[in-house]
Interface confidence: low
């Protein structure tokens, strides 16, 4: 079972959306909250939350030190949420530290937020 969180947390994917002309009438993209910086310990689990709202619902990508984040089975994963996206890194190692950026786009606009894991 995944650990449940007290912050925005466990609601998930928003991938293949049907974007109708109706949806496009009132398009917007908002960063609901800047990403937090996180300090944690080796071996622990870290979570970064990208909180965005948009119409049409945004596509969200994650970058670490400007390179796309690659998921690792059972260790590093990200899930889209109805609030945006959540990046989870388990069993932290020193190599996991760095600048993490989420980039959200609704096809018209782009917003991003950066947090530091150290």
């Amino acid at each position: 079972q995944e650990t449940e969180l007290s912050v925005s947390a466990e609601l998930v994917p928003t991938s293949s959306w049907n974007i109708s002309s109706e949806l496009n009438k009132d398009s917007y993209l908002t960063l609901d909250e800047p990403m937090n910086n996180i300090t944690t310990s080796l071996g622990q689990t870290a979570e970064l939350h990208c909180k965005v709202s948009g119409n049409p619902p945004p596509t969200i990508r994650w970058f670490k030190n400007d390179a796309p984040v690659v998921q690792e089975p059972r260790r590093l994963s990200f899930r889209s949420t109805i609030y945006g996206s959540r990046l989870r890194i388990r069993n932290l190692d020193t190599t996991d530290t760095g600048y993490f950026q989420c980039v959200a786009t609704n096809g018209k606009e782009v917003v991003s937020s950066t947090g530091v894991l150290f």
């Epitope: 449940e4 609601l11 994917p13 928003t14 293949s16 609901d32 909250e33 709202s53 619902p57 609030y83």
Partner: antibody, heavy 114, light 107 residues
Framework: QVQLVQSGAEVKKPGASVKVSCKAS????????MHWVRQAPGQGLEWMGW????????KFNHKFDGRVTMTRDTSISTAYMELSRLRSDDTAVYYC???????WGQGTLVTVSS | DIQMTQSPSAMSASVGDRVTITCQAS??????LIWFQQKPGKVPKRLIY???SLANGVPSRFSGSGSGTEFTLTISSLQPEDFATYYC?????????FGPGTKVDIK
């Protein structure tokens, strides 16, 4: 422990407005979304929308567009849902629920009757 | 809007029975599904999230399966306190939509 405590039952006339409050304790209101869900007597559940108390952003079910307002007062850790132009079919129990629907308020019965 | 349907709408069962409730979405919702239990006059209680993850404090006799458009809530051995109405909720798309509910009562 996490608690959501809602305001008491209301009786309103058609065309009036009602404002329901939801006071949060045991966690940080501003970093968790707050959903509002309603349930008419003997019926199922209906999602109305959410507010992000951190900045006041809202997302509504289009069914309620123009009639629902969601606000918050972070100084007293309270979220509010106001529904205007009430009709008899708005008679329901109104619930607030935290981000992931893991904690719910006890519900507020709103009766709309002439 | 995504339509959620549940079957059966009501069922009678006995203590110890294995109970299966299904929820169908009108389009693919991945695993964006929550199951709730609600007893008369009470607040809904979250049982399962991510379609298959058991919420904290929920007995292991409850389990969820499925993805895409077909989902199942299973109670492996029905207990007296399980007689209630069960709802599914999709959170793939706005507006979030609930199923109409399945009432489980005593046979």
């Amino acid at each position: 422990q996490v608690q959501l405590v809602q305001s008491g039952a209301e009786v309103k006339k058609p065309g009036a407005s009602v404002k329901v409050s939801c006071k949060a304790s045991g966690y940080t209101l501003t970093t968790n979304y707050m959903h509002w869900v309603r349930q008419a007597p003997g019926q199922g559940l209906e999602w109305m929308g959410w507010i992000y108390p951190g900045n006041g952003n809202t997302k509504f079910n289009h069914k309620f567009d123009g009639r629902v307002t969601m606000t918050r007062d972070t100084s007293i850790s309270t979220a509010y849902m106001e529904l205007s132009r009430l009709r008899s079919d708005d008679t329901a129990v109104y619930y607030c629920a935290r981000s992931d629907f893991d904690y719910w308020g006890q519900g507020t019965l709103v009766t709309v009757s002439s | 809007d995504i339509q959620m349907t549940q079957s059966p709408s009501a069922m009678s069962a006995s203590v110890g029975d294995r109970v299966t409730i299904t929820c169908q979405a009108s389009q693919d919702i991945g695993n964006n599904l929550i199951w709730f239990q609600q007893k008369p006059g009470k607040v809904p209680k979250r049982l399962i999230y991510f379609a298959t993850s058991l919420a904290n404090g929920v007995p292991s006799r409850f389990s969820g399966s499925g993805s895409g458009t077909e989902f199942t809530l299973t109670i492996s051995s029905l207990q007296p306190e399980d007689f209630a109405t069960y709802y599914c909720l999709q959170y793939r798309e706005y507006p979030l939509t609930f199923g109409p509910g399945t009432k489980v009562d005593i046979k």
